[in-house]
Amino acid sequence: EVEKTACPSGKKAREIDESLIFYKKWELEACVDAALLATQMDRVNAIPFTYEQLDVLKHKLDELYPQGYPESVIQHLGYLFLKMSPEDIRKWNVTSLETLKALLEVNKGHEMSPQVATLIDRFVKGRGQLDKDTLDTLTAFYPGYLCSLSPEELSSVPPSSIWAVRPQDLDTCDPRQLDVLYPKARLAFQNMNGSEYFVKIQSFLGGAPTEDLKALSQQNVSMDLATFMKLRTDAVLPLTVAEVQKLLGPHVEGLKAEERHRPVRDWILRQRQDDLDTLGLGLQGGIPNGYLVLDLSMQEALS
């Protein structure tokens, strides 16, 4: 808390300008009128205030707007936004996409902070829906934001946004989200040639259906085990031993280390043992020779 002291003679701020960088904390508190600050917030960003000075300015705004800042002030917070806590932001009602963009710009290049997460949450709740413009904005600033959306929300993500997604941005996506994102990625990258296409689509393959995996197996892609282990089990099960061998290329040897983990474990159980033996990896658990395989799920469907 800054002590209340009288403003020295001739120091009363008539406008928010660069001369304020010379003011000590107590001078800013005493000589800057909060209402003046609020009306000239757009100037604050153009002045290299120290963090301590920004604390004083924030304190003045907090006193002026105890119930939360109006959007006219929020839009021009600039680097003062970095001083806000999630609790401060929860008091705001942000409805303008321009305001959202202005504040995301301040945090550009940094990881998503709790402040930004709270801001986005407030914005989406205030709008009542995640429209295309909002999604475009959010995915442009934070491609990783995709994984925090529900499959329903993801359905309105434009394929063009997929180009900005980096592999690590999908790390927290679950299979249901990848089911929605994969077809969009397939569409976005459809004009790329084989090897380039695989590099781009690889991160999204957790949502790929069997037929797409079969098609990839014909293209000498040499999928790594880490990617294979993230594939949908139901998409992997119908693949033949030959198809998996082509899909993984030299990485096929890694199956041995993963034979107890899904989807490899479940896939092994569906393969004929003599087919598995052709890999020469010592994979065990396949269907013994001479056994007939009945697809019970098909039988149930017919009855």
Epitope: E18, P48, Y79, L82
Partner: antibody, heavy 119, light 110 residues
Framework: QVQLVQSGAEVKKPGASVKVSCKAS????????INWVRQAPGQGLEWMGI????????KYAQKFQGRVTMTRDTSISTAYMELSSLRSEDTAVYYC????????????WGQGTLVTVSS | DIVLTQPPSVSGAPGQRVTISCSGS????????VSWYQQLPGTAPKLLIY???QRPSGVPDRFSGSKSGTSASLAITGLQSEDEADYYC???????????FGGGTKLTVL
């Protein structure tokens, strides 16, 4: 056109003080802040502080606090930088530079003043 | 005391493209504009780029600046012999209210 002309080279003994001047012309002297930046031989640039010629307010880099004094004489459009308790490490070229409002940059520089501290 | 980190030297042949990186922190580059200065041998520094990526009039468009997070870079395309100089990045630091410079990068045109 805007010009910043600095005083000539100085040789000082350790413990002494030096006062470098910077005469401005071609613009309203009180309308732009003046910064002082130094550069030791073969080294990089180092910011020392800033003065507002309008009111004389100053802000110094922590490293020079207590040793540097920046002043100005508006009647002759001149800024001064005085550095006391000189040591050999203070041997450097000292530049004055005009601060351009709104962009936090030094748009015009003086030609530099070499200060040599030697016993 | 150097707050912004630059490579000590870079080089390139005439006509080539070179980039000079500048790494800082959230209190300087991360929350303030970046400027670049060019210092030819024996002369005062000259402003090259301001506000992260703006060029003052008279500076050729071969020079461009960019910034992301707490790092900035200067790119020079179509390298010319007269570009041989020291280049400094700089920014205001909000932690202590000082102006900070990088250690400088010597550009050699081969």
């Amino acid at each position: 056109q805007v010009q910043l002309v600095q005083s000539g080279a100085e040789v000082k003994k350790p413990g002494a003080s030096v006062k470098v001047s910077c005469k401005a012309s071609g613009y309203t002297f009180t309308g732009n802040y003046i910064n002082w930046v130094r550069q030791a031989p073969g080294q990089g640039l180092e910011w020392m502080g800033i003065i507002n010629p309008h009111g004389g307010d100053t802000k110094y880099a922590q490293k020079f606090q207590g040793r540097v004094t920046m002043t100005r004489d508006t009647s002759i459009s001149t800024a001064y930088m005085e550095l006391s308790s000189l040591r050999s490490e203070d041997t450097a070229v000292y530049y004055c530079a005009r601060w351009h409002h709104g962009t936090w940059i030094f748009d015009y520089w003086g030609q530099g003043t070499l200060v040599t501290v030697s016993s | 005391d150097i707050v912004l980190t630059q490579p000590p030297s870079v080089s390139g042949a005439p006509g080539q493209r070179v980039t000079i990186s500048c790494s800082g922190s959230s209190s300087n580059i991360g929350s303030n504009y970046v400027s670049w200065y060019q210092q030819l041998p024996g002369t005062a520094p000259k402003l090259l780029i301001y506000n992260d990526n703006q060029r003052p009039s008279g500076v050729p468009d071969r020079f461009s600046g960019s910034k992301s997070g707490t790092s900035a870079s200067l790119a020079i395309t179509g390298l010319q012999s007269e570009d041989e100089a020291d280049y400094y990045c700089s920014s205001w630091d909000r932690a202590d209210g000082s102006y900070v410079f990088g250690g400088g990068t010597k550009l050699t045109v081969l």
